[in-house]
């Protein structure tokens, strides 16, 4: 229904707290370099204006669209051109082009300092002094580093943060209470960020139809007792919510997400028997809980998929009369029977089925042609199953750090032209799949591994798009989203690469490495490992292991030495010589 004032409507629906949080996230995601204070000032102005519209919907400018209102605010920021360069050109455009322009200037890898968590006492003091400002800073800092973070979900993480601080700041040992809990929230939030970025990529590159297919598969796995009409409704609504968030329409997105959660809780009987626990929670927790609710028990008496989609004499007729619905029904039926498959795999199978029907329904004897289609799925299913087994075996053997290093070597060989920081970030993220997924029960491993890898590789593609350097990466990133992971897995050593010259300074270290936190130490060592591979792309695993063991031993010895600086300056060159010899 149309409202006289969109801003008043959203303010009333969302309430002041969520309204302000979402406006802050929106501004922080669009203008990523502005300080918290600059954005907080704008948020307050927008909120005050929204309140005047609530009081009188006919007041001046209350009938303007949210894009117009927010865009005008952003464009009024002083020194926009000096700080943001060509983004300022967006302000010469009219809506909707202006908003599209802002979206195109979102930076997936902004040059901002890492988000450092303050020391526990300082954090608790700030939080107690002004919890609202403290949480505002959290929203601002996360949103500007993750310009596509799912806004209503970021409000949920802020709420989690708030609860943890409230609890831990009352304890004697604040540090040991806060650290594990906040680390847990950070890990979950980072995964949420890459997953949402993947959804926005799907929407941006392939449109709503592609996202809706993803949603149908995912929802059918989770709610196998819902019928196709119910799944279609949920997928359509979920597509709208994600389209809005990916498009920067955060107030509409959060409002529609709340509506969807309400619908699901009012229609549990037709959706799933597992929703009640989620539905008893308050809004942000409810929506979060529903998004990761456990799979409902599969109906016991599902007929074989072949009956409707292979053996039926009218397959081609049914396909011709409503292609999207027929393929949607196939995807729904296949997905509800396979919670053990990844969404990416299910979409590849649906694509294969569609291609088979396109080909076979044009032939003289279609049933003879498409009769073997389910058997042809086998290699598509085996490939990711083997990937999971091989990688989980390797993870169990090496542990997370060793597994990351194995991936780093593999990916540096596949795409040695990619910058070392990007390769290290990607390998560290890809390597976490072991900890995240390999410990799960067998039937949950494949969906966990492949869908997580796909999201991480999407980030690799986004970073590579900014400065394309590898033909291998360009090839895999240009295809469809569901084919990316198999494409990257199939890449071998890039034979076109001319090895990097050996530079001693790349492998020269100083005593400051000794005081770094473990994570930073690992990154330094992994940076060296990537550089070694770039120098010798065809080095064997044994050669690389010898060098890395020697390197670890060198660090251990020098960091324990009484005179660390002398140790590093004398033993460092010896290490470099031994490395060169080992790789010769």
């Amino acid at each position: 229904e149309a409202h006289k004032s969109e801003i008043a409507h959203r303010y009333n629906d969302l309430g002041e707290q969520h309204f302000k949080g979402l406006v802050l996230i929106a501004f922080s995601q669009y203008l990523q370099k502005c300080s918290y204070d600059e954005h907080a000032k704008l948020v307050q102005e927008v909120t005050d204006f929204a309140k005047t519209c609530v009081a009188d919907e006919s007041a001046a400018n209350c009938d303007k669209s949210l894009h117009t209102l927010f865009g005008d605010k952003l464009c009024a920021i002083p020194n926009l051109r000096e700080n943001y360069g060509e983004l300022a050109d967006c302000c010469t455009k009219q809506e909707p082009e202006r908003n599209e322009c802002f979206l195109q200037h979102k930076d997936d890898n902004p040059s901002l300092p890492p988000f450092e968590r303050p020391e526990a006492e300082a954090m608790c003091t700030s939080f107690k002094e002004n919890p609202t400002t403290f949480m505002g800073h959290y929203l601002h800092e996360v949103a500007r580093r993750h310009p596509y973070f799912y806004a209503p979900e970021l409000l949920y993480y802020a709420e989690q943060y708030n609860e943890i601080l409230t609890q831990c700041c009352a304890e004697a040992d604040k540090e040991s209470c806060l650290t594990p809990k906040l680390d847990g929230v950070k890990e979950k939030a980072l995964v949420s960020s890459v997953r949402q970025r993947m959804k926005c990529s799907s929407m941006q590159k392939f449109g709503e139809r592609a996202f809706k297919a993803w949603a149908v598969a995912r929802l059918s796995q989770t709610f196998p007792n819902a019928d196709f009409a119910e799944i279609t409704k949920l997928a359509t609504d979920l597509t709208k919510v994600n389209k809005e968030c990916c498009h920067g329409d955060l107030l509409e997105c959060a409002d529609d997400r709340a509506e969807l959660a309400k619908y699901m809780c009012e229609n549990q009987a037709t959706i799933s028997s597992k929703l009640q626990t989620c539905c008893d929670k308050p809004l942000l927790k409810k929506a979060h809980c529903l998004s990761e609710v456990e799979h409902d028990t599969m109906p016991a008496d599902l007929p074989a998929i072949a009956a409707d989609f292979v053996e039926d004499q009218e397959v081609c007729k049914n396909y011709a009369e409503a292609k999207d619905v027929f393929l949607g029904t196939f995807l729904y039926e296949y997905s509800r029977r396979h919670p053990d498959y990844s969404v990416s795999l299910l979409l590849r199978l649906a694509k294969k089925y569609e291609a088979t029907l396109e080909k076979c329904c044009a032939e003289a004897n279609p049933p003879a042609c498409y009769g073997t289609v389910l058997a042809e799925f086998q290699p598509l299913v085996e490939e990711p199953k083997n990937l999971v087994k091989t990688n989980c075996d390797l993870y169990e053997k090496l542990g997370e750090y060793g597994f990351q290093n194995a991936i780093l070597v593999r990916y540096t060989q596949k795409a040695p032209q990619v910058s070392t920081p990007t390769l290290v970030e990607a390998a560290r993220n890809l390597g976490r799949v072991g900890t995240k997924c390999c410990t799960l029960p067998e039937d949950q491993r494949l969906p966990c591994v492949e869908d997580y890898l796909s999201a991480i590789l999407n980030r690799v593609c986004l970073l590579h798009e900014k400065t394309p350097v590898s033909e291998h990466v360009t090839k895999c990133c240009s295809g469809s989203l569901v084919e990316r992971r198999p494409c990257f897995s199939a890449l071998t050593v890039d034979e076109t690469y001319v090895p990097k010259e050996f530079k001693a300074e790349t492998f020269t270290f100083h005593s400051d490495i000794c005081t770094l936190p473990e994570k930073e130490k690992q990154i330094k060592k992994q940076t060296a490992l990537a550089e070694l591979v770039k120098h010798k792309p065809k080095a064997t695993a044994e050669q690389l292991k010898t060098v890395m063991d020697d390197f670890a031993q060198f660090l251990d010895t020098c960091c324990k030495a009484a005179d660390k600086d002398t140790c590093f300056s004398t033993e460092g060159p010896n290490l470099v010589t031994r490395c060169k010899d080992a790789l010769a």
């Epitope: 019928d227 196709f228 009409a229 119910e230 279609t232 409704k233 949920l234 359509t236 229609n267 009987a269 037709t270 409707d308 009218e314 049914n318 009369e321 409503a322 619905v325 027929f326 029904t329």
Partner: nanobody
Framework: EVQLLESGGGLVQPGGSLRLSCTAS????????MGWVRQAPGKGLEWVSW????????YYADSVKGRFTISRDNSKNTLYLQMNSLRAEDTAVYYC???????????WGQGTLVTVSS
């Protein structure tokens, strides 16, 4: 093309019964949720009842619960509505509807008039 043909309407006394039928063609009947929608004189459309593709779940509006029964025969591409204990307020044109998405219908028939009057 999609066709839905209702039959079985008519004039009936309060407390009486009727059975509506709907024969479907032009689409894969067994893949779709089907339902009955009605429009009383001077009123809007309202969902009366719907049934899942496999017949395992049925929905009824509160106003007809316990009196109406929806069923389907996928082998005959036919939808039914058994209406018992009819009341004057059940007077309406009853439409058979095909639902592609929960809460919406994309096709419905010409309708059959049910008049409950003494």
């Amino acid at each position: 093309e999609v066709q839905l043909l209702e039959s079985g309407g008519g004039l009936v006394q309060p407390g009486g019964s009727l059975r509506l039928s709907c024969t479907a063609s032009g689409f894969t009947f067994r893949h779709y949720r089907m339902g009955w929608v009605r429009q009383a004189p001077g009123k809007g459309l309202e969902w009366v009842s719907w049934i899942r593709p496999d017949g395992t779940f049925t929905y009824y509006a509160d106003s007809v619960k316990g009196r109406f029964t929806i069923s389907r025969d996928n082998s005959k591409n036919t939808l039914y509505l058994q209406m018992n204990s009819l009341r004057a307020e059940d007077t309406a044109v009853y439409y058979c509807a095909k639902s592609y998405m929960a809460g919406t219908f994309d096709y419905w028939g010409q309708g059959t008039l049910v008049t409950v009057s003494s």
